[in-house]
């Protein structure tokens, strides 16, 4: 922690300006008055101050504002930022997307994923909801941010916006930010034609249940093997092998590069091996011919 | 074929909470979304929100303060919680089944539970 | 939220002639709208959805028609077991919302 002296007279400061570099720390903690520190924050990234003395002036704001900076201040933060952890930006109170747009500026190519994180989540707190210009700061300020979001904070993305979402954008998101999206993806697209229609969902259907996938197989889609290995488990087991092949139509080769990985590995021992042999890949582990299959999933729901 | 039963008190005092629950038989929970709708007495239809197996919930905002949709998929079960209830609430809910059979699906209903009436009353 | 008014609030048609009920959005729904029938102590039954398509195991006699904010259902010779309560539904966009109902009444 910074020493606390008087500050010289001679060392009194007035205005934040570039003199404040050849300060030492405890002659910055005596003589930088935090709310003038405050009223001058614009000023500060463009001054070449060390990270050491970076620390003394957050310490400062820290003092003036304990519950939070206020937005006036977080705007102006600059390299500020970097020495920010998501402990203290919890407490900010963010509404500005052009706020947003200078911190993630700062961000860029520094370990900050917490933190950015964390701001994403205020700013949406902020705002009410995910609308379409955060959205869109998001995909052009920081393509994946998204999918740093919570599933409860992606709940109140309305599905019209969701159009503004491109696939990379969607690239780190897991299955429970999916669940989320998909529905909504679903719902913004359902006036477009089959192939329009494909896609545009195709990035979300990490997300779909079993009985969409079904629909999707009889639409003639073609489905990529990429795009068919992020489908939930659950949504590929009850799939047949005549509905996995009209699925990914000339894609169902794949299958035999991705036999042992999940949810092709899964799939396979559901299926009876005459049924795979009709695909003519070679794939191996299906049920033999003669065992009876018992669903027992139902038969638990039905008892 | 899947079918859909709700269960719960037909009974809830005023500012309490309502539960319900449904019984998915006959075929997976995981495969569709499900909804909760109610219909007060002599009335029209109101959705009060859907749940994916995994959790996911989108609710009516104009319950949604007070709605909690949640899922069981080892009991194949869903159930609604509807807190700080008044008179207002009285209605027969029911579960239903989204549709998902279709090309481009869409958020309406072909499968129903036969319905719980519920009062609020002290 | 979107609105939807059904018109009329109650119909009174003869057996062996046709209904028709109209459905209006307060803003456009494209085709996501959905018919239901109920029957008194019953859950609602689907018979139209994407504003004409037919669902399973409903009789050609239930037709749907029209798109954006205009929306009619047609029955076009009733029988005894059509005599019900009718709703329309949008699903355009969350909230899911429904008309307050047609009842079609014997005359």
């Known amino acids: 922690d910074v020493e606390r002296t008087t500050c010289p007279p001679e060392k009194e400061v007035h205005e934040i300006d570039e003199s404040l570099i050849f300060y030492k720390k405890r002659e910055l903690e005596a003589c930088v008055d935090a709310a003038l520190l405050a009223a001058q924050m614009d000023r500060v990234d463009a001054i070449p101050f060390t990270y050491e003395q970076l620390d003394v002036l957050k310490h400062k704001l820290d003092e003036l504002y304990p519950q939070g900076y206020p937005e006036s201040v977080i705007r102006h933060l600059g390299h500020l930022f970097l020495k920010m952890s998501p402990e203290d930006i919890r407490k900010w109170n963010v509404t500005s997307l052009e706020t947003l747009k200078a911190l993630l500026k700062v961000s860029k190519g520094h370990e900050m994923s917490a933190q950015v994180a964390t701001l994403i989540d205020r700013v949406v707190v902020g705002r009410g909801q995910l609308d379409k210009d955060t959205v869109d700061t998001l995909t052009a300020f920081c393509p994946g941010c998204l999918c740093s979001l919570s599933p409860e904070r992606l709940s109140s993305v309305p599905p019209s916006v969701i159009g503004a979402v491109r696939p990379q954008d969607l690239d780190t998101c897991g299955p429970r930010q999916l669940d989320v999206l998909y529905p909504k993806a679903r719902l913004a697209f359902q006036n477009m034609s089959g192939s329009e229609y494909f896609v545009k969902i195709r990035p979300f259907l990490g997300g779909a249940p079993t009985e969409d996938v079904k629909a999707l197989s009889q639409q003639n889609v073609s489905m990529d093997l990429a795009t068919f290995m992020k489908l939930r488990r659950e949504a590929v087991l009850p799939l047949t092998v005549a509905e996995v092949q009209k699925l990914l139509g000339p894609h169902v080769e794949g299958l035999k590069v991705e036999e042992q990985h999940s949810p092709v590995r899964d799939w396979i021992l559901k299926q009876r091996q005459d049924d795979l042999d009709t695909l003519g890949l070679g794939l191996q582990g299906g049920i033999p011919n003669g065992y009876l299959i018992l669903d027992l999933s139902v038969r638990e729901a039905l008892s | 074929q899947v079918q859909l039963q709700e269960s719960g008190p037909g009974l809830v005092k005023p500012s309490e909470t309502l539960s319900l629950t449904c019984t998915v038989s006959?075929?997976?929970?995981?495969?569709?979304?499900w909804s909760w709708v109610r219909q007060p007495p002599g009335k029209g239809l109101e959705w009060i929100g859907y749940?994916?197996?995994?959790?996911?919930?989108q609710s009516n905002p104009s319950l949604k303060s007070r709605v909690i949709i949640s899922v069981d998929t080892s009991k194949n079960q869903f159930s609604l919680k509807l807190s700080s209830v008044t008179a207002a609430d009285t209605a027969v809910y029911y579960c239903?089944?989204?549709?998902?059979?279709?090309?481009?699906?869409?958020?309406?209903?072909?499968?129903w539970g036969r319905g719980t009436l519920v009062t609020v009353s002290s | 939220e979107i609105v939807m008014t059904q018109s009329p609030a109650t119909l009174s048609v003869s057996p062996g002639e046709r209904a028709t009920l109209s459905c209006r959005a307060s803003?456009?729904?494209?085709?996501?709208l959905a018919w239901y029938q109920q029957k008194p102590g019953q859950a609602p039954r689907l018979l139209i959805y994407?504003?004409?398509t037919r669902a399973t195991g409903i009789p050609a006699r239930f037709s749907g028609s029209g798109s954006g904010t205009e929306f009619t259902l047609t029955i076009s010779s009733l029988q005894s077991e059509d005599f019900a309560v009718y709703y329309c539904?949008?699903?355009?966009?969350?909230?899911?919302?429904f008309g307050q109902g047609t009842r079609l009444e014997i005359k």
């Open positions: 239903a089944r989204e549709v998902g059979r279709i090309a481009v699906a869409g958020w309406f209903f072909d499968l």
């Open positions: 539904q949008q699903y355009n966009n969350w909230p899911l919302t």
């Open positions: 749940i994916f197996y995994s959790g996911s919930t």
């Open positions: 006959g075929g997976s929970i995981q495969n569709y979304y």
């Open positions: 803003q456009s729904v494209n085709s996501n």
């Open positions: 994407g504003a004409s």
